[in-house]
Structure formats: C-alpha cells, structure tokens
Interface confidence: low
C-alpha cells in the first residue's frame, strides 16, 4: 500500500549521512517506471534539505543530525509520478518524529532566588518556589523531568534540616520549628535541579531565605527608676528620657516603642512621646507644674510596641520621681484685662481707677507698678497703690490713639524677688462722649450758576456721639442771608444752600452757623464760586468771544 507509518528518528544521530530511513513504494511500479519525490518543511521548504528521497528507489534519506529542541516533528508529503510526469498516487503523509536524547542540562531561571518567612512559623509553612527549565522532552521521556533537592543549608542552626523542597514543584517549605530571626536572620540554601527525574545531570542555584521579624520580644526599660527636677510653670519642658532595649528588628513596628503613663498623673500634667531614631520615651510637661500646690509627682510608665506581641509577654514598667522646683513667679494682674468707663476731657489729676496685681508665690512680696505703654501720654500710675490718674486730656475723638471709643494702656507690676519678675496687665478705657465738637459742613467749597441756580446739598458731620449730634440747625450770619438761604433737611443731617438773588460772577464767602442737638455751635465759612451760567455747573466757563 502507498502508506508509511510514522518514522521515529533519534536526535543528534552520528550518521553516516545521508542515512536511509524508509522506502516509499507504489505498487503502480509494476505497470510503469515510477519517480519519487518529497515536499514540505525539511524537504523543499525551510529548513530545506534535511530530508531527501532517492528519485528512483524511493529511499527516504536523512542528510544531517536532527535537533528535537529545534524541530520535534516533520510533516512531509511523498509523491509518485510516471515517466511522463503524471501523478500515479495521491500525495502521502510522511510523519517523522524526532525522539529526544538527554542533551540539555536543567538550568535555573535565576542564579539566586529570594524568599522570606516569619520567624516562629509552624512546620509546613511555604516559603518560596525555585524553578529550573530543561529543554529536553519531559512528556515522553524523563530527559526533561526536573527533580529538585536541597544540597546544603547555611548556617546549620538550630540544625541543618530547617527546610524541605518539593521534588517536582520546587516549593521550599519550613520543616522544623525554631526559626528565630534574633539568632539567624537569613539562611542560604544550595538547591539542585536534576533531570531524568533526579537521576541525570544536575545544576545548582542559591535560595536565600530571609527570616522576617515577629514581635516576640518585649521592650524593657533600662534603667527602670528615674529621678528628675523640673522648674514650676514650665510647659513643654523635657523632664526625662526613658531608655528601652528591644531585640526585635530595629526601626520596625515590633521594635518601635509606645509609652503610656499608667499612674501618678491625675492632673494630666505630663505627656510622653517616642523619639523616632533612638526609640527613647521623652517625658515632657503638658502644662506648668505648681510648686505651691504639689512639689513632687511619682509617675508610672509602661512600654509596649507599635505592633502587638505575637505571644504573651510581660510588659516593663518604669518609675519616675519628678521634683518640682520653686520659681519666683510673676505678679498677675486681676483681671488680666480691665475695662473702665471714663468721661473724655476729665480734669488733670482726676483718678481713673485702681489696677493691682497678685503674686502667686507664698512669701509676701512687695509689688510696684508703672505704666508700660500709654500711646498718648494721658495717664500716670502710683507705684505703690496702682492708682491710675489723668495727666493729659482724654479725647474720644482722637483717631490716632482711640479705636471704637477705647483707649488701650499696658501696665507693669514688678515683685521684689530674686531675681525680680514682672507681669503685665491691659487697661481698656472706654471713653464716654461729651459734646465737645460742633457740626461741620462738607464740602466747604461750592460752584453755582447765577441764573436758574441748582440747590447745593452739604453733608453735616459731628465727631461726637448721639445725643450730641443730629438733628442739626442752620443759620446764615454776617449778612449772608441777603443773597443765600440755608435749610436743614427733614432727617437733619444735610443742609441745602440756595442763591436767592442774582450775583455777578465772582467768589463769595457764605457764613454758615450749624448747631447740634446739644446746642454746640460751629461757624464755618463756605467759599462759593458764582458763575455766569444757567442751571448746573462744575467750573465757570471762560468769557465768550464772538466771531
């Protein structure tokens, strides 16, 4: 029959070449001379020339050694034609299977594999996987079947069989208990990959297993007892640095300390923070300590870690005795800011108020007073009694020194301690208005036409406060009423000035007297420019020139 069974050819054949593989034979050769040929990849297409056929005998020839890792199977077609070139058979499938030789070693995909596992884990915990490849056939032969093994372990502590490797997957697992990062932080395993499922060629690689830290060591105070001295009243003052040791991995959550004041700080006077580099506990004052109230505090501080302990561990406690040192404290004005109402313009020498301070110290210290800041120079203060008196004219309307009716003064108290200390107080004088200002019109210059003039509206201002302001009254004096009229509007805050008789173009003085609700009168001269024009004007036109 015109059929060829699959032909198996081992790779890396030694020859000699060409090597006869099989004979193609058509039974039509009884009737006519047959010529044989082959086509397909490996024959007439790339890689050409690997196989050939003896044209007349039909022998299939192999021209060179085969490489299964390059091409594992060739699919060719056999052809039979008569002398005249006519096809006498259908093309026949020729399958050539390249059988494997163990001509490749396993090769690890990395020189060094890295993995990690927590210290103290149970046997059976998976750590990492190593991988080796072998280009040989692992399906039909064992040539490419890789078996993994551990050749050696460094260090061999606590013993030399801490890990195992799965023969076929390369998964490395913990086989023994006793992984302790604080004793052995890293293991180096020499792993082997052997083909023929462990019976063939071997290659090695390194597997580095990093032992990760678990919080299996508690921080411990060293020392456990401290004495410290702190001046009273100091806020944010560093009282003491507490030192701990922890065997866990530095700068990890299992090593970083967390401090807690367990007792002795009923008044919430202290706080403790962790120094980011040294891991020390920094005890500081949250608020000032008072020697007069309590001159000694005994604190109990406990230390743990940022990370929870992985097993039950005793916590370490430190005792800190804090001695409060007496300090000469500054006198304190009572109240620190004092508001006093006083009428503006009171006579010089008139008392304003008494403003005194108290000394927190237990000794009876003498306190003396003086004015520290008096912007307008209006006040004086008795050094012994704290009596404040007027030495200048208090003016509510003085915009340079008075804001919102308030004049602010700073006073100082000094004790006779060693060294002396000072305290300050603020005196806020609310100045009560008196009717010491008359009303004033704005603007004080006007321009008006002498024909059909527009009425001029002037605003009235008075620096005083109600009731010493509107309603205002207006009156023209010094014969100004011959040519002008002045009327206050209904609201009483503006005055309307009108020209009632013709005046030639010129500048005139209009004498306007305004008085407020308290009859405080103010005379103001208004400069009126009269123009030769009709109705509204802003500036006088120049003389008209004909032509």
């Amino acid at each position: 029959d015109w059929v060829v069974a699959p032909i198996s050819v081992p790779e890396n054949g030694k020859g000699p070449f060409p090597q006869r593989l099989n004979q193609l034979k058509s039974n039509k050769d009884r009737d006519t001379k047959i010529f044989y040929s082959i086509t397909g990849p490996g024959a007439d297409s790339p890689p050409e020339g690997v196989f050939a056929v003896e044209k007349e005998t039909g022998w299939l020839l192999l021209n060179k050694p085969l490489d299964r890792e390059e091409i594992a199977k060739y699919e060719l077609f056999g052809h039979a034609v008569s002398e005249n070139g006519a096809s006498v058979e259908d093309p026949m499938n020729i399958s050539i299977i390249v059988t494997d030789q163990n001509d490749h070693k396993p090769k690890f995909t990395q020189d060094t594999f890295r993995g990690s596992v927590l210290e103290g884990v149970m046997p059976g915990t998976s750590v990492m996987q190593v991988t080796a490849t072998d280009e040989d056939d692992a399906v039909n032969t064992y040539n490419g079947v890789v078996a993994y093994s551990i050749h050696s372990q460094e260090p061999k502590e606590p013993h030399d069989l801490m890990f195992t490797i799965h023969k076929s997957t390369g998964t490395i697992s913990v086989i023994s208990s006793g992984l302790d990062r604080e004793k052995v932080p890293e293991y180096r395993l020499t792993v082997q990959a052997t083909d023929m499922d462990g019976e063939g060629s071997t290659t090695t690689a390194e597997a580095v297993v990093q032992i990760l830290d678990a919080n299996d060591n508690a921080p411990e105070f060293d020392p456990q007892k401290y004495e410290a001295h702190v001046p009273e009243n100091a806020v944010g003052h560093e009282v003491q640095r507490l030192t701990v040791t922890d065997l866990d991995a530095p700068n990890s959550p299992a090593w970083r300390a967390t401090y807690l004041i367990m007792g002795g700080d009923d008044g919430d006077h202290f706080t403790i923070t962790t120094h980011p580099e040294s891991n020390q506990g920094i005890l500081t004052t949250r608020k000032g300590l008072d020697f007069e109230a309590k001159n000694q505090h005994t604190l109990y501080v406990e230390v743990t870690n940022e990370a929870p302990f992985v097993l039950k561990l005793p916590t370490s406690t430190a005792t800190i005795v804090v001695h409060v040192e007496d300090v000469n404290e500054a006198p304190v004005f009572v109240p620190p800011s004092k508001v006093v109402e006083v009428q503006e313009g009171i006579p010089t020498g008139e008392p304003v108020c008494v403003y005194t301070a108290e000394d927190p110290d237990k000794e009876n210290q003498k306190i003396s007073y003086r004015i520290l800041r008096d912007p307008a120079g209006w006040l004086a203060m008795d050094p012994d009694s704290g009596q404040v008196t007027a030495v200048g004219t208090l003016d509510r309307e003085d915009e340079q020194f008075v804001r919102n009716n308030i004049y602010e003064v700073m006073v100082l108290a000094m004790d006779n301690g060693s060294p002396p200390t000072t305290g300050t107080g603020t005196l806020l004088l609310t100045l009560i208005d008196v009717n010491d200002h008359g009303p004033v019109p704005e603007p004080r210059q006007i321009t008006i036409c002498n024909q059909s003039p527009v009425r001029q509206v002037l605003n009235i201002t008075d620096k005083d406060l109600s009731p010493h302001t509107s309603p205002f009254q207006a009156q023209l004096t010094d014969d100004s009423d011959i040519y002008w009229t002045a009327e206050v509007n209904e609201e009483g805050d503006t005055v309307v000035l009108s020209l009632k008789k013709f005046l030639k173009q010129d500048t005139y003085d209009v004498h306007l007297s305004l008085s407020d609700h308290g009859n405080k009168e103010q005379l103001t001269v208004i400069r009126a420019t009269v123009c030769d024009c009709h109705g509204h004007v802003e500036t006088c036109p120049g003389p008209w020139k004909g032509g």
Epitope: P46, P47, E48, G49, E69, E70, K105, K107, F108, T109, Q110, D111, E135, T203
Partner: antibody, heavy 121, light 107 residues
Framework: VQLVEQSGAELVKPGASVKISCKAS????????MNWVKQRPGKGLEWIGR????????KYNGKFKGKATLTADKSSSTAYMQLSTLTSEDSAVYFC??????????????WGQGTSVTVSS | ELQMTQSPASLSASVGETVTITCRLS??????LAWYRQKEGESPQLLVY???TLAEGVPSRFSGSGSGTQFSLKINSLQPEDFGNYYC?????????FGAGTKLEIK
C-alpha cells in the same frame, strides 16, 4: 535597560597574558550565553567562543583553543576572557555580546563597547 | 569550515536610494543567518536574525530574505545613519562565522 559594559584598553608586552571583563546588567546573566568576538584594525569580525554563566559550559572556535579562556562570575554578573602568550596578531578590539536566547540558533543582540588590546614591546 | 561570501565589498549610494547586499554560503544553513551594521568606532548592532526577523527597534526600511545558501539584506530609502559596515553571520552551526563585510558609503 540591558547593558554590557567592558573593561578599558590594555597595552601588553609580547608573550604576556591579559584578562578582559564584561559586566552585564538588566537581564538574567546566568541564563544567557555570552559570546566573544575579535576585530583586527580595519578588518572583519571573528567569533572566538561562548560561555553559559549558569554552569560555566563553554564552546570555542577551534582557531582560538589554547589562546582564549572564557570564565564567568555569577555573583558580579561579569564574564571574563583571558588571552595568553600574546603576539602582534592578537592586537585587536575584543567585543563581548549576549546571545539572544537559549540554544545555538540565535543571534547576538547586546554588544559591549569593545576593549582594545595592543601588543607591543 | 563553512565559507561565506559577502558582496559587494563596498557600495556607494545616495540618501533616498535602495540598496541590496548579498551573502552566499558554502553549505545549507536553512534560515539561520543574521545581519549586523557597524559604524566607525562603534560596536556591531543586530539588524535581522533568522534570515528575515527584524531586531527590536530596527526601522521597517530594512528587510532580510533568503534561505539555505543564498541570503540578502535590502535597505529602502537610505538615511544618513544607515552608512557604515554591514556583516552577515551564520548562527546555525559552530563556529559562528561572519562575512567579510560590505562598506556602504555616502555618494
């Protein structure tokens, strides 16, 4: 970025030996063949041999057997070529070049910048 | 030993032209031929391998063809950076021989 960095130029006396290096980075050094190629001034390229750093396997051009010795240090990802009993014929630029993949049937895709060796008394 | 004949030995062309370099071998290496370009004072650069596969980053104006014993490298629309020495290389069997080279110069 895959890089192949070679050692600097060498001036050596006839009869002496020289060892030149080729440091690789950016790829799996131990699982790629490293080739060495010679180029005399104004001439073409000659393949010297290759080494598989993973297990030290070597293959030489017969012409350079006894002249060149190829080694590799996996820990530093460095390949070395030692040239012995130097003559003026050995004055050339020597390139190292990474082979593209496993197996023989691949080309050289990353080349070092070359090391010039001058043999002169 | 496998013999490789690269032609022409030198070639002068202008920017924008198309050129072809050939490489003939004394025995069948199937499709396992590579092409490299080397500029003055530089390392060789892989252009094509397995007869027609372009290496990473190589412009499409380069194309390789051939199999068995006859191979060629074609460069369409020459650019200024294309000038230099071109080498073919057998990467099928040991030793990995190179052709003698073709010097491509600017006209």
């Amino acid at each position: 970025v895959q890089l192949v960095e070679q050692s600097g130029a060498e001036l050596v006396k006839p009869g002496a030996s020289v060892k030149i290096s080729c440091k690789a980075s950016g790829y799996a050094f131990s699982s790629s063949w490293m080739n060495w190629v010679k180029q005399r001034p104004g001439k073409g390229l000659e393949w010297i041999g290759r080494i598989y750093p993973g297990d030290g396997e070597t293959k030489y051009n017969g012409k350079f057997k006894g002249k060149a010795t190829l080694t590799a240090d996996k820990s530093s990802s460095t390949a070395y070529m030692q040239l012995s009993t130097l003559t003026s014929e050995d004055s050339a630029v020597y390139f190292c070049a990474r082979q593209r993949d496993y197996g023989a049937l691949y080309a050289m895709d990353y080349w070092g910048q070359g090391t010039s060796v001058t043999v002169s008394s | 030993e496998l013999q490789m004949t690269q032609s022409p030995a030198s070639l002068s062309a202008s920017v924008g032209e198309t050129v072809t370099i050939t490489c003939r071998l004394s025995e069948n290496i199937y499709s396992y031929l590579a092409w490299y370009r080397q500029k003055e004072g530089e390392s060789p650069q892989l252009l094509v391998y397995n007869s027609k596969t372009l290496a990473e980053g190589v412009p499409s104006r380069f194309s390789g063809s051939g199999s068995g014993t006859q191979f060629s490298l074609k460069i369409n629309s020459l650019q200024p950076e294309d000038f230099g020495n071109y080498y073919c290389q057998n990467h099928y069997g040991f030793p990995f021989t190179f052709g003698a080279g073709t010097k491509l110069e600017i006209k």
